[in-house]
Interface confidence: medium
């Protein structure tokens, strides 16, 4: 079986994940995308997903999470904002193909967030907070219910992520201050 | 084979502004990381910021963010460095250079691996 | 922002030599490092990338290792083109930043 891999990002509360899944773009560009988080020994839970058919860059948010998927690049741009240190835990970007099982699209992404200011300069206590004004979605996006047995992990650490009502603005500290560390498998 | 052309060497003013292009030619353009590095003469590397294009919105060192703007165009597949209010000090080579990434959110994993000619700016009054 | 300090800051070497430069980093940034060269009035080049992994097109003589906050470019055998200025940068988070550099030159 081939191994799966994760990229791990370290962040503050407060700050935004702000990820790309790229996918296959002849096969996928207007397939319905979502945005999964996977729970210790439970099947992965859909937090966001993109319309179906997928549009062509625009922005689906559901609470603090942003999708958008850009056809042209074969990606989907995953964006959570104003982290919680309760959001803490592994994702991953699956591809909707019914009758077929959910394509997962590699790496997964285990996030891990602390509590306490990030102390990166340009983004302190005292600056102006940025804003991202994000138009709200005319359509809801409806996301299938079903899961992929097979993506079941046994030790991912448990965690909530926090859905909330959508929102047509959301402000944002700390939105430059994008952390990636690697992980090698 | 990716290769990024900058635009041409630059004499300016105490006080004045200068504006800095790359252009990319082969490869794709709109999803890797642009960031723009410069050095001064007999200095090391100075990272100023850096845009993913497709994304639109840069990131600034902070010794620069209240004096640079960066900026790209996906049509032409060129982005900019514009310097506002040039001291002597910003007498310096500028380079751009591109950082990718092959996978899930990989933005820049390769580090930043083609890069620029550079660009000669002289601050001079 | 992240600082890194590499050492020593300048080195002189014989062709053949083994060298080692090391880059620490302020606080851990796990494995995003990459390390360049730079000859005089050219722009760097890239030889490694995250952290061990030897870009293309760069001779096997150079390697990285490391991860966190210490990291070390060994070249294994001197050549007489490997003569120039070397850097690492961490891409972990912004801003992106650079060591000070390290001046290899002919004994």
């Known amino acids: 079986a081939t191994k799966l891999t994760e990229e791990k990002y370290e962040l503050k509360e407060g700050q935004t994940l702000d990820v790309k899944c790229d996918y296959t773009l002849e096969k996928f560009a207007s397939s319905q995308k979502a945005w999964q988080i996977i729970r210790d020994g439970e099947m992965p839970k859909t937090l966001a997903c993109t319309e179906r058919p997928s549009k062509n860059s625009h922005p689906v948010q559901v609470g603090r999470i942003i999708l958008e998927d850009y056809h042209d690049h074969g990606l989907l741009r995953v964006r959570m904002v104003n982290l919680q240190v309760e959001d803490s835990g592994l994702y991953q970007c699956v591809i909707y193909q019914p009758p077929k099982e959910p394509h997962m699209l590699f790496d997964r992404i285990r996030l891990v967030v602390t509590k306490g200011f990030s102390g990166t300069p340009g983004s302190n206590e005292n600056s102006t907070q940025n804003v991202y004004k994000i138009p709200p979605t005319t359509t809801k996006a409806l996301c299938p219910l079903y899961t992929s047995p097979r993506t079941v992990t046994q030790a991912p650490p448990k965690s909530t992520a926090d859905v909330s009502t959508p929102d047509s603005e959301i402000n944002l500290t700390n939105v430059t201050d994008i952390i990636r560390v690697p992980v090698f498998n | 084979q990716v290769q990024l052309v900058q635009s041409g060497a630059e004499v300016k003013r105490p006080g004045s502004s200068v504006k800095v292009s790359c252009k990319a030619s082969g490869g794709t353009f709109s999803i890797y990381v642009i960031s723009w590095v410069r050095q001064a003469p007999g200095q090391g590397l100075e990272w100023m910021g850096g845009?993913?294009?497709?994304?639109?919105?840069?990131n600034y060192a902070q010794q620069f963010q209240d004096r640079v703007t960066i900026t790209a165009d996906e049509s032409t597949r060129t982005a900019y460095m514009e310097l506002n209010s040039l001291k002597s000090e910003d007498t310096a080579v500028y380079y751009c250079a591109r950082g990718h990434g092959p996978g899930s959110s990989h933005y820049s994993y390769y580090g930043l691996d083609v890069w620029g000619q550079g660009t000669t700016v002289t601050v001079s009054s | 922002d992240i600082q890194m300090t590499q050492s020593p800051t300048s080195l002189s070497a014989s062709v053949g030599d083994r060298v080692t430069i090391t880059c620490r980093a302020s606080?851990?940034?796990?494995?995003?490092l990459a390390w360049y060269q730079q000859k005089p009035e050219k722009a760097p080049k890239s030889l490694i990338y995250a952290a061990s992994s030897l870009q293309s097109g760069v001779p096997s003589r150079f390697s990285g290792s490391g991860s966190g906050t210490d990291f070390t470019l060994t070249i294994s055998s001197l050549q007489p083109e490997d003569f120039a200025t070397y850097y690492c940068q961490q891409y972990n988070s912004y801003p992106y930043t650079f060591g000070q550099g390290t001046k290899l030159e002919i004994k």
């Open positions: 845009i993913i294009p497709l994304f639109g919105t840069p």
């Open positions: 606080q851990g940034i796990s494995s995003w």
